[in-house]
């Protein structure tokens, strides 16, 4: 399976690293310092 972080979610995380959690079939963001929220906005 393709990693959605490299496709439709490649710009999802504004100030952070996109991570695809296979078990949950979900994308999450690992935010850079001082950024928070679902998309590290």
């Amino acid at each position: 399976k393709k990693n959605p972080c490299n496709a439709e979610f490649q710009n999802f995380c504004i100030h952070g690293e996109c991570k695809y959690i296979e078990h949950l079939e979900a994308v999450t963001c690992k935010c850079q310092q001082e950024y928070f929220g679902e998309r590290c906005g």
Epitope: I21, H23, L24, E25, C29, K30
Partner: antibody, heavy 125, light 112 residues
Framework: EVQLVESGGGLVKPGGSLRLSCAAS????????MSWVRQAPGKGLEWVST????????YYPESVKGRFTISRDNAKNSLYLQMNSLRAEDTAVYYC??????????????????WGQGTLVTVSS | DIVMTQSPDSLAVSLGERATINCKSS??????????LNWYQQKPGQPPKLLIY???NRESGVPDRFSGSGSGTDFTLTISSLQAEDVAVYYC??????????FGQGTKLEIK
């Protein structure tokens, strides 16, 4: 109350097949990855298979790869394990287990937080 | 594959005394300061029960005499004051995102 109830175990001859089921209730089944873990008589725990929330990703150890297939039906809150080409060494109690998890700051930590009572599979001629 | 090795295989401890079970992984189960290591208790005729997750987090409802510690490749489960109901087999398990999700061989805890 979270409940996991396995069924489908029994006596089967070597080379035979069996399909195990796990009926889940008390939680949103489609939100959790699920696994099968087995325990041979008097032995320790062995992970057998895992399936992701929607069934897109499945995982197996080498000991069962190509013989066992895990699947799920989220509409029926059910987990399955199709076991083919069974061997004597597959004799065990088979447990279904839910993957509890923490998801924070991009980190995913998981663990088996609920287990069924198990169903016994005996492979013998 | 990550191999999990517990020590000792069996342990006899007096009531009220401390019990310590060790778990060693063949490679680190840490990632950026997080430890992907869980502990389970299994009593005879019962399924396993989660005690500790992420190395040191006690599952809800688990008595506070149970604690977990460690990082990297070396982990410990401690029961601070053994009770009769703690007689069981204890297992560690690594839960990195990379299968196989291996368990230790188990440690049988008995009353001395």
């Amino acid at each position: 109350e979270v409940q996991l109830v396995e069924s489908g175990g029994g006596l089967v001859k070597p080379g035979g097949s069996l399909r195990l089921s796990c009926a889940a209730s008390g939680f949103t089944f489609s939100s959790y990855a699920m696994s099968w873990v087995r325990q041979a008589p008097g032995k320790g725990l062995e992970w057998v298979s895992t399936i992701s929330t929607g069934g897109s990703h499945t995982y197996y150890p080498e000991s069962v790869k190509g013989r066992f297939t895990i699947s799920r039906d989220n509409a029926k809150n059910s987990l399955y394990l199709q076991m083919n080409s069974l061997r004597a060494e597959d004799t065990a109690v088979y447990y279904c287990a839910r993957h509890g998890y923490l998801l924070y700051e991009g980190y995913y930590e998981w663990y088996f937080d609920y287990w069924g009572q198990g169903t016994l599979v005996t492979v013998s001629s | 594959d990550i191999v999990m090795t517990q020590s000792p295989d069996s342990l006899a401890v007096s009531l009220g005394e401390r019990a310590t079970i060790n778990c060693k992984s063949s490679q680190s189960v840490d990632y950026e300061g997080h430890s992907f290591l869980n502990w389970y208790q299994q009593k005879p005729g019962q399924p396993p029960k989660l005690l500790i997750y992420a190395a040191s987090n006690r599952e809800s409802g688990v008595p506070d005499r149970f604690s977990g510690s460690g990082s990297g490749t070396d982990f410990t489960l401690t029961i601070s004051s053994l009770q009769a109901e703690d007689v069981a087999v204890y297992y560690c398990q690594q839960s990195t995102e990379n299968p196989p999700y291996t368990f230790g061989q188990g440690t049988k805890l008995e009353i001395k």
